[in-house]
Amino acid sequence: QGWQAFKNDATEIIPELGEYPEPPPELENNKTMNRAENGGRPPHHPFETKDVSEYSCRELHFTRYVTDGPCRSAKPVTELVCSGQCGPARLLPNAIGRGKWWRPSGPDFRCIPDRYRAQRVQLLCPGGEAPRARKVRLVASCKCKRLTRFHNQSELKDFGTEAARPQKGRKPRPRARSAKANQAELENAY
């Protein structure tokens, strides 16, 4: 499969509550978007007759507690992991380790967060410490979207940590965002 999911399970502290649409996309930059060497993505066939809306990415809900050192949220939050197929499978290799990748020449569609929501959480700390109030930003929905320069530079910044690791005989390609990004979830507190 040449289509990479985003492992969006990071929760970050934000300054204000509200709904957060994705920042406006910048103009596409084919140089950064489509090259296989950019992040180690294999090339793929361009979309021709199929509309991206015909493909469906998955919104997988997980329940977890927000932590900050020894402190833990009183109630769990629901996180969404965006994952799934945003391109025509028939144009991808028909077996892991077999087939061949098409030359890159079209837009790259990925299953990424579409909207975010903010949630206030109360963190309970051991040792009689006073509870802390925090606001966290959580993924609210996912969508198959055209990868833009904005995504390439910000959303993809964690990509490539394992880019050199070939999988099951495929060409080297990045694993999606490491869930380790969670560890920074409360380091961005304002």
Partner: antibody, heavy 120, light 107 residues
């Protein structure tokens, strides 16, 4: 190579608890979900739930809420499933499996299974 | 929850036959349909994912197809080593669900 090594068979008393482990090796543990699946003798497969080891996030099949508790230890790349208040209905083989959610959207590697027998 | 139905619980066929196992979902699962093979008292193995993609080492006599709610697994030239139980599974949304399985036997 990718391996999921499960703990050995368990013979336990009704009303007690058991904790099954699944040690992952050969891949980045936090980059894949671990799913748990139940199979009663001669029966089909039943999805219990999933854990995202990177965040500790879980999702349970409604039927197993209160019965199964999933956890993961990143430092040892091991996932755990605790089953509580055991009854004869819990006698089964329990599998852990890795879900490659960035590429395959399926459980691409499975543990060998852990047999849990609940008997007085 | 999405129900997965494998209407045939067991299937007898001769070596060399073309065998098709069907699976139906209670709602559209957008091709997130996987097939697993389990040999008697053995582990579970992923055969096909995302409807039609074979995993490494799976013989090319296996193929998968379908869309929407109806999916199938075909073995084009049945071999002795294909004797097993086959399960379909939807990976579209939690809770993931499996079909009840189809046991393949030799006539």
């Amino acid at each position: 190579q990718v391996q999921l090594q499960q703990s050995g068979a368990e013979l336990v008393r009704p009303g007690t608890s058991v904790k099954v482990s699944c040690k992952a090796s050969g891949y980045a543990f936090t980059n894949y979900f671990i799913e748990w699946v139940k199979q009663r003798p001669g029966q089909g497969l039943e999805w219990i739930g999933a854990i995202n080891p990177g965040s500790g996030g879980t999702n349970y099949n409604e039927r197993f809420k209160g019965k199964a508790t999933l956890s993961a230890d990143k430092s040892s790349s091991t996932a755990y499933m605790q089953l509580s208040s055991l009854t004869s209905d819990d006698s089964a083989v329990y599998f852990c499996a890795r879900e490659d959610y960035g590429d395959v959207y399926a459980m691409d590697y499975w543990g060998q299974g852990t047999s849990v027998t609940v008997s007085s | 929850d999405i129900q997965m139905t494998q209407t045939t619980s067991s299937l007898s066929a001769s070596l060399g036959d073309r065998v098709t196992i069907r699976c139906r979902a209670s709602q559209d699962i957008s091709n997130y349909l996987n097939w697993y093979q389990q040999k008697p008292d053995g582990p579970v193995k992923l055969l096909i994912y995302y409807t039609s993609t074979l995993t490494s080492g799976v013989p090319s006599r296996f193929s998968g197809s379908g869309s929407g709610t109806d999916y199938s697994l075909t073995i084009s030239n049945l071999d002795q080593e294909d004797i097993a139980t086959y399960f379909c599974q939807q990976g579209k949304t939690f809770p993931f669900t499996f079909g009840s399985g189809t046991k393949l036997e030799i006539k």
